[in-house]
Interface confidence: medium
């Protein structure tokens, strides 16, 4: 049986939309599938790599690599999207390419970045972990770390940094899929909202879905002990 909930929820474009949340109901009247997985049910994607989920994550990453920061022209906010999802008339799509990207570093003058921009994250303004010396962030946004400390400056002069961020990574469903969404939408969909991250590649949704002890390597499920727990 399915339980369907419909509600007006604030979406990425800053408008309220009618959204459906479909929950598979427990036939025996009890915890939801998400809760059962958290409690240690035998769920194979938490025990070993699942090809289908791996393909999904790789597909999400490929899309994210090509994303940019969509900044609303009315200063109402910004969100990480694909170019096709960013209005050409109402917004500005900030995407580094050709010669528009910043230099890789103050000590690497000849190479400019082509991957980015990312809403609210920039290697030039992040102090922890700083992109410098032997630890220059790669020219691939899907390999960027979470920035835990920004340079103390209220304005950077960058469109993608000085805007109000409207969406962050949200882990939705037992498949561990990730979307950049508003907090409101994420909570309605019973997802896990990552306030600390800017990109889906920075979060490991399956680790969150599985719960219990975190994976030793967040990319590799290793909860063999589930076989005995249930």
């Amino acid at each position: 049986a399915q339980h369907v909930t419909t509600q007006l929820v604030l979406r990425n474009k800053g408008v309220y939309e009618s959204v459906k949340y479909i929950q598979q109901e427990n036939f025996w009247i009890g915890p939801s599938s998400i809760d059962l997985i958290h409690l240690g049910a035998k769920f194979s994607p938490c025990i070993r790599k699942d090809q289908q989920i791996e393909q999904l994550v790789l597909r999400e990453r490929d899309l994210e690599r090509d994303s940019g920061c969509c900044v609303q022209n009315d200063h109402s906010g910004c969100i990480q999207t694909q170019r096709k999802d960013c209005s050409e008339t109402l917004a500005t799509f900030v995407k580094w390419q050709d010669d528009t990207g910043p230099p890789m570093d103050k000590s690497d003058l000849g190479q400019k970045r082509t991957s980015g921009a990312v809403c609210h994250q920039d290697p030039r303004t992040c102090e922890e972990p700083a992109s410098s010396g032997a630890h220059i962030w790669p020219d691939d946004i899907t390999k960027w770390p979470i920035c835990t400390e920004q340079a103390k400056s209220n304005r950077t002069g960058f469109l993608h940094m000085d805007c109000q961020i409207k969406g962050r990574p949200c882990c939705i469903s037992t498949k561990g899929s990730c979307e950049i969404t508003t907090r409101e939408y994420c909570e309605f969909m019973h997802g896990y909202f990552h306030e600390e991250a800017t990109l889906c590649s920075q979060v490991h949704c399956l680790d969150k879905v599985c719960g219990l002890l975190p994976f030793l390597n967040p990319e590799v499920p290793d909860q063999f002990y589930r076989l005995w727990l249930s």
């Epitope: 010669d99 910043p102 030039r124 950077t156 002069g157």
Partner: antibody, heavy 123, light 106 residues
Framework: QVTLKESGPGILQPSQTLSLTCSFS??????????VGWIRQPSGKGLEWLAH???????YYNPALQSRLTVSKDTAKNQVFLKIANVDTADTAIYYC???????????????WGTGTTVTVSS | QIVLTQSPAIMSASPGEKVTMTCSAS?????MYWYQQKPGSSPRLLIY???NLASGVPVRFSGSGSGTSYSLTISRMEAEDAATYYC?????????FGAGTKLELK
């Protein structure tokens, strides 16, 4: 409007330390992405980059002169300093400071130059 | 360090004439920068990132090139263009300048 002005001793003797000051206005070195560089030009010759300093106190020096150079800044006073130790007659030149094109924009260049200060090393 | 060789060292051109000077790098650089210096004055930025005109620079100036070979072109020489032109690389430290091309008015 961005302006920079260099000042120095004019004349000094070999083995002394040359102290130069670059006083600027129209921008702040506490602003993200700003930098100031030093370049010199011996009379009738070409330009030689010496050093530059960034808003975050990151410093870069010409390796050929590194052991003798020290660059520093006083953000509050809008000043950048260059010291050259143990000068020689070969250090006689016009010394320029220039604002490094904002690291915050995505370009690098010596955007605005000072008028230069002439330094003569003579015994 | 990257050595920049400018040629010719000295050249002259008549008003209206097209002028091209070159800058050759000892190893490949990503971008080239050009400055103009008139006697008794400070250098002035003309072109950044190989082909972008700096603010206030007349459109008769243009830059091109890649790798180790770059050039600066003035489509129609004017009297005020008589000056020394320097190329500069920001590719690696130390930052280096070419020895300059002195452009005189014929």
């Amino acid at each position: 409007q961005v302006t920079l002005k260099e000042s120095g001793p004019g004349i000094l003797q070999p083995s002394q330390t040359l102290s130069l000051t670059c006083s600027f206005s129209g921008f702040s070195l506490s602003t993200f992405g700003m930098g100031v560089g030093w370049i010199r030009q011996p009379s009738g010759k070409g330009l030689e980059w010496l050093a530059h300093i960034w808003w975050d106190d990151d410093k870069y020096y010409n390796p050929a002169l590194q052991s003798r150079l020290t660059v520093s800044k006083d953000t509050a006073k809008n000043q950048v300093f260059l010291k050259i130790a143990n000068v020689d007659t070969a250090d006689t030149a016009i010394y320029y400071c220039a604002r490094v094109g904002n690291y915050g924009s995505n370009y690098w260049y010596f955007a605005v130059w000072g008028t230069g200060t002439t330094v003569t090393v003579s015994s | 360090q990257i050595v920049l060789t400018q040629s010719p060292a000295i050249m002259s051109a008549s008003p209206g004439e097209k002028v091209t000077m070159t800058c050759s790098a000892s190893s490949s650089v990503s971008y080239m920068y050009w400055y103009q210096q008139k006697p008794g004055s400070s250098p002035r930025l003309l072109i950044y990132d190989t082909s972008n005109l700096a603010s206030g620079v007349p459109v008769r100036f243009s830059g091109s090139g890649s790798g180790t070979s770059y050039s600066l072109t003035i489509s129609r020489m004017e009297a005020e263009d008589a000056a020394t032109y320097y190329c500069q690389q920001w590719n690696s430290y130390p930052l280096t300048f070419g020895a300059g091309t002195k452009l005189e008015l014929k």
